[in-house]
Amino acid sequence: QPPPPPPDATCHQVRSFFQRLQPGLKWVPETPVPGSDLQVCLPKGPTCCSRKMEEKYQLTARLNMEQLLQSASMELKFLIIQNAAVFQEAFEIVVRHAKNYTNAMFKNNYPSLTPQAFEFVGEFFTDVSLYILGSDINVDDMVNELFDSLFPVIYTQLMNPGLPDSALDINECLRGARRDLKVFGNFPKLIMTQVSKSLQVTRIFLQALNLGIEVINTTDHLKFSKDCGRMLTRMWYCSYCQGLMMVKPCGGYCNVVMQGCMAGVVEIDKYWREYILSLEELVNGMYRIYDMENVLLGLFSTIHDSIQYVQKNAGKLTTTIGKLCAHSQQRQYR
Amino acid sequence: SAYYPEDLFIDKKVLKVAHVEHEETLSSRRRELIQKLKSFISFYSALPGYICSHSPVAENDTLCWNGQELVERYSQKAARNGMKNQFNLHELKMKGPEPVVSQIIDKLKHINQLLRTMSVPKGRVLDKNLDEEGFESGDCGDDEDECIGGSGDGMMKVKNQLRFLAELAYDLDVDDVPGNNQQATPKDNEISTFHNLGNVH
């Protein structure tokens, strides 16, 4: 084993290095001292370190470690943050296009239903946006609300134009009739199925990306324990106490220390792997009715078909509803 | 018969269904993200090694510091003997993860469970029992998956997927529809966001 080089007789080198860490030289001994009060850099002979210096080294070591950890995760963090933002924005754009397509369909095919239809469509797509972002909204309720709102307007404007402008009273009866008589056939149920499946998947996808950011942020800002700080100090700085300024830690030693310091963090590994593989599985299944882009941009067409379906059955419906909502209608005609 | 929404924009910019060779749709963007994420699948297990390779460490054939003294080769046993008066590496590992790490592990377990529940098994088909009583059946084909675009009559079955990058530059505005308060014109930054995605690694 090679003999250690003789320590700097004046601690001059140590002082000039330490000055960069901590301006003001009062903590560095003029000449090597016994260092009996040291707790981390236990000396085998005289040392150029004091207890105060050791504390500063520990603080610096932990800060270094935090910076290294942050730079390690920077690329991954940027990848997920940027994609989460891009997808959220893209989904909002899809929702906006879907809303515009649907409004355009009403304008072209059913001008008499506008502008009320625009408001109902607006409410529906507002709720779609909020659902994707994690709000506690029930998709079936959203779809029911859309058809419940549309039917009174369809009834009074398309099927029974002689009726005065619908009031809340008759509207409520018509809303009830809409469900009881399955006025739109199976279209509401079909839309519920497609919209709920595609939005659920979209929502969980965004939630997963946001959790990914949270995972990285958590490990990015970990505060390392005192024990870890001591190990890092011993690895990076204790050599300085002996005047060995240019010496680097052994590779194997570094790995052991890092595994010790990161034992807790490394426990995430198993769940992180599973997270990426599960996300991949989800993404592979995001097509057809599990793809919100596909579903929402086709909604205008399904809604159009549902209104045609009502018109096809208008005769039968008007008679039935005439009896069912007679009471409300009489009150309105008065 | 219904119309394609594009008919609306004849007077404005017609929405061309551009067949861009490398057009980036949402689904291609998702797959690209997964591929990039998979390159980070060993991120946490590789962290100790990564940090050592990015901090000053001696080359194999040079003298190095083992926490006690200068040595030619690192021996874990020797280093451990030197450390035993201080703190035990094994104890440090036994302490278990920080509370914040345990918390995030719980969240990961939860999302993984959700992701597995939501993942679509290959070949899963929608329930076929959508045709219940009503005035008439819902006018849809055999495979409900294909029923997104509604019935025939020149109506498209499924709207061509929004071109993730290409189409965003088009004006899909329905602002001229009275009562439609929503601004539909893509904001400048929407367009630039998507055009500047580049290859994020």
Epitope: S129, L168 | N181
Partner: antibody, heavy 116, light 102 residues
Framework: QVTLKESGPTLVKPTQTLTLTCTFS??????????VGWIRQPPGKALEWLAL???????RYSPSLKSRLTITKDTSKNQVVLTMTNMDPVDTATYYC?????????????WGQGTL | QSVLTQPPSASVAPGKTARITCGGN??????VHWYQQKPGQSPVLVIY???KRPSGIPERFSGSNSGNTATLTISGAQPMDEADYYC?????????FGGGTK
């Protein structure tokens, strides 16, 4: 914390236009799911909803007053403005603005102090 | 004439349970919110989405909603609970308040 404050003239002549400003803090009208609504209450009477504006600039109006009302927002100033044309003595009331959580079925969870 | 019907007034002895109703055709399918308004003050949300209580609202306030009636219940009513109470629901694109119960 969330606070809202209404401001505007105390007195308006018949046929004139009333302009009310709601200045708020503690939230942003660019945040998804946020809205601001206007409600009025004639002396000794019930609350009556007037208008609601969403974060995405969607607007909803009371059908009976729709032709007279305009609601706008200035996100950078944290303000919402309501204008009501053709004022009449029956429009005498305390006018409140309120923060709305759109996702919670348009609940009004924070109210201003009101302006008479 | 409001589409949500509330009794104009209700009284209860201190410590007893007060119930205020809000009637509306099929109101059970709507989310109902309740506000308390004391003289000279702004309304305060006490129950939202039928049954949920905002933070800071005492546990004695609870709500339910089914069929054609939503109900606000104050169990163990206190003198400080004396106020006007309004129910509110969202009808498609319209916000509707009840006539209030004193």
């Amino acid at each position: 914390q969330v606070t809202l404050k209404e401001s505007g003239p105390t007195l308006v002549k018949p046929t004139q236009t009333l302009t009310l400003t709601c200045t708020f803090s503690g939230f942003s009208l660019s945040t998804s799911g946020v809205g601001v609504g206007w409600i009025r209450q004639p002396p000794g009477k019930a609350l009556e909803w007037l208008a609601l504006i969403y974060w995405n600039d969607d607007k909803r109006y009371s059908p009976s007053l729709k032709s007279r009302l305009t609601i706008t927002k200035d996100t950078s100033k944290n303000q919402v403005v309501l204008t009501m044309t053709n004022m009449d003595p029956v429009d005498t009331a305390t006018y409140y603005c309120a923060h709305s959580r759109i996702a919670a079925r348009r609940v009004l969870d924070y109210w201003g102090q009101g302006t008479l | 004439q409001s589409v949500l019907t509330q009794p104009p007034s209700a009284s209860v002895a201190p410590g007893k349970t007060a119930r205020i109703t809000c009637g509306g055709n099929n109101i059970g399918s709507k989310s109902v919110h309740w506000y308390q308004q004391k003289p000279g003050q702004s309304p305060v949300l006490v129950i939202y989405q039928d049954t949920k209580r905002p933070s800071g609202i005492p546990e004695r306030f609870s709500g339910s909603n089914s069929g054609n009636t939503a109900t606000l219940t104050i169990s163990g009513a206190q003198p400080m609970d004396e106020a006007d109470y309004y129910c509110q629901a969202w009808y498609s694109t319209i916000m509707v308040f009840g006539g209030g119960t004193k």
